[in-house]
Amino acid sequence: AVNGTSRFTCFYNSRANISCVWSQDGALQDTSCQVHAWPDRRRWNQTCELLPVSQASWACNLILGTPDSQKLTAVDIVTLRVMCREGVRWRMMAIQDFKPFENLRLMAPISLQVVHVETHRCNISWKISQASHYFERHLEFEARTLSPGHTWEEAPLMTLKQKQEWICLETLTPDTQYEFQVRVKPLQGEFTTWSPWSQPLAFRTKPAALGKD
């Protein structure tokens, strides 16, 4: 018997992927478990194999279709079950009715690029990936800039409260190496959370002109 807590958490990327994590204190690492998805108004069922990601945590992705296909809507309910093998049979360990558009986590923004860089400022753009057209413009972003001698955790967060896929960073130091990251979140969904941070974009400001401050 497991004495600690267990937790089953899933997020929908708004298109064709439900990512799930099952954690269970005291569970054996070599336990074989699966996630089963059973939608209420679709003809498909889907299963993925939970694979270890840490000492007592397993994860898998339910791939529902091609990356940009719209496989679920706000009225869908998907019953999700964790099934683990015990000897010769499968035993249900967790169950929930999952409302995809209440549990959103988008893919990290991609295609970050420097549009224009000067001594004290830099204009950066990016794209969102595999995001549903249902959101229209109802998205927000957070961005952060890594300055020399600091950590990402120390970087102040900049909030963009609209679907704006660019930013102009100001008050930068000339001839200095920086890194930049951005993440996205839909406004919809009670349990919706931020996407992972994008891959960092490295850039360098231009040196100050000779003879000037």
């Epitope: 807590t5 937790r7 169950i95 929930q96 009670e190």
Partner: nanobody
């Protein structure tokens, strides 16, 4: 915050049936997985079964599978435990419980946040 109140317990002969009810108040009932646990004298509290938010999915402890059925009526904020073919070893205090809103139901009592006071079920031989 969710408040839970069980009812329907009592004394029944082996082989008989009983239906327990659990009335919920507070938050939106349909956001919660609901579960039943039981505790016999001198024993640990054990999982009986759980039902998903819409009632589409259920699962049960091996000891009650095929004899007990959990159902719910969200409009009435109530979950039920229908117990058939009762045995003396089913004697226990039965508790209704729920995890936090949006969380999955599991077999593990540590994962449940809200609990009723319990209702006594006694099965005589």
């Amino acid at each position: 915050q969710v408040q839970l109140q069980e009812s329907g317990g009592g004394l029944v002969q082996a082989g008989g049936s009983l239906r327990l009810s659990c009335a919920a108040s507070g938050r939106t009932f349909s956001n919660y997985v609901m579960a039943w646990f039981r505790q016999a004298p001198g024993k640990e509290r054990e999982f009986v079964g759980a039902i998903t938010q819409t009632g589409r999915g259920t699962f049960y402890a091996d000891s009650v599978e095929g004899r007990f059925t959990i159902s719910r009526i969200n409009d009435k904020n109530t979950v039920y435990l229908q117990m058939n073919s009762l045995k003396p070893e089913d004697t226990a205090v039965y508790y209704c419980s729920a995890p936090r809103s949006g969380r999955a139901g599991t077999r593990n009592q540590m994962d449940y946040e809200y609990w009723g006071q319990g209702t006594q079920v006694t099965v005589s031989s």
